[in-house]
């Protein structure tokens, strides 16, 4: 009862998380325009990992893409890189996930089988949530050392007066979004790893079941063939299953409802 | 770089109109506000008009009800109309502009042109 919890609350808790980390990769207000101690300026700026936008005090709104790759910082490209790997990982885990939770039965699989799927789907939830942080931490460090760089000036150049702004953008509501996103992402993803322990079958050994024969010396070799004397009713050589290797516990039978007598 | 030519100005009796152009060459962008400021002799520089590319106009008090500002971002020209000119009407008008580039990381500047002297004298 408590694995199924634990795989049901992984599975919810991940879901959540890649459906925060998807709405964060498309969010605009990965930076904002740093309004504090800054010159009064008509617009508010905000960027996304795909556009940029102008907010008027008005309410007017323009949003533009960015219609290059080569123009963009390489930083840039490497949180969309990250930030896509963990939302198709995360993606793929879901999927995963749903054949592996112990609550729904499909067909004949066996609790092994359940309990690799539920392992692997709680490792790529863990790699995605990693990669969304990563991301969003990558894109933060950019910002705080693009807004200690920037600076503002004035000058009178060829027809008239010119001021640089500092325009300096800062930590958008998408940021916190995407870790939050990540960190229960991970958080599901490790449940999801704990459920598998729980999943696992533990070994049931009936390994050495004892076949009495109504002959009266009878030989016993665990996990062999049952060597007979020929006299009574076992003149055939039976195969006792063996499960494989064994422990030297296990090396006497126990008594068990599959003994004959 | 943007270049502000304003146009238009003069002397003209108090009561008159007049009305000043001003165009913008140069690397436009995103032009943010386009709008006119004023200095009369020993006078502060002071926001006469301006209206953002997304239509919002702002007037200085002593202007509203009798100055019109207009702009057409294709041509990326700015004009104020000035109808009922008064006496302290008279400066220098400059014009305005807020540009901001384009793509990742938009910086904004501000561009003033030279300048058109406004006298209104009788």
């Known amino acids: 009862m408590a694995v199924t919890a634990c795989q049901g609350l992984g599975f919810v808790v991940s879901l959540i998380g890649i459906a925060g980390i998807i709405a964060a990769t498309c969010m605009d207000q990965w930076s904002t325009q740093d309004l504090y101690n800054n010159p009064v300026t008509a617009v508010f700026n905000y960027q996304g990992l795909w556009r940029s936008c102008v907010r008027e005090s008005s309410g007017f709104t323009e949003c533009r893409g960015y219609f290059t790759l080569l123009g963009l910082p390489a930083m840039l490209q490497a949180v969309r890189a990250l930030m896509i790997v963990g939302i198709v990982l995360g993606a793929i885990g879901l999927l995963v996930s749903i054949f592996a939770l112990k609550c729904i039965r499909i067909g004949s699989m066996e609790d092994s089988a359940k309990a690799n799927m539920t392992l692997t789907s709680g490792i790529m939830f863990i790699v995605s949530g990693l990669c969304a942080i990563a991301g969003v931490s990558v894109f933060a460090n950019m910002l705080v050392t693009n807004f200690w760089m920037s600076t503002a000036n004035m000058y009178t150049g060829m027809g008239g007066m010119v001021q640089t702004v500092q325009t300096r953008y800062t930590f958008g509501a998408a940021l916190f979004v995407g870790w939050v996103a990540g960190g229960l992402t991970l958080i599901g993803g490790v449940m999801m790893c704990i459920a598998c322990r729980g999943l696992a079958p533990e070994e049931t050994n009936y390994k050495a079941v004892s076949y009495h024969a109504s002959g009266h010396s009878v030989a016993y070799k665990p996990g062999g063939f049952k060597a007979s004397t020929g006299f009574g009713s076992n003149t055939k050589n039976k195969k006792i299953y063996d499960g494989g290797a064994r422990t030297e516990d296990e090396v006497q039978s126990y008594p068990s409802k599959h003994d004959y007598v | 770089d943007v270049q502000l030519q304003e146009s238009g100005g003069g002397l003209v009796q108090p009561g008159g109109s007049l009305r000043l152009s001003c165009a913008a060459s140069g690397s436009t962008f995103r032009m943010n506000v386009m709008g006119w400021y004023r200095q009369a002799p020993g006078k502060q520089r002071e926001l006469v008009a301006t209206?953002?590319?997304?239509?919002?106009?702002n007037y200085i008090d002593s202007a509203r009800g009798r100055f019109t500002i207009s702009r057409d971002d294709a041509k990326t020209t700015v004009s104020l109309q000035m109808n009922s000119l008064k006496p302290e009407d008279t400066a220098v008008y400059y014009c305005y502009t807020e540009v901001q580039t384009t793509g990742w990381n938009p910086q904004i500047y501000n561009y003033w042109g030279q300048g058109t002297q406004v006298t209104v004298s009788s």
């Open positions: 209206m953002t590319k997304g239509g919002s106009t």
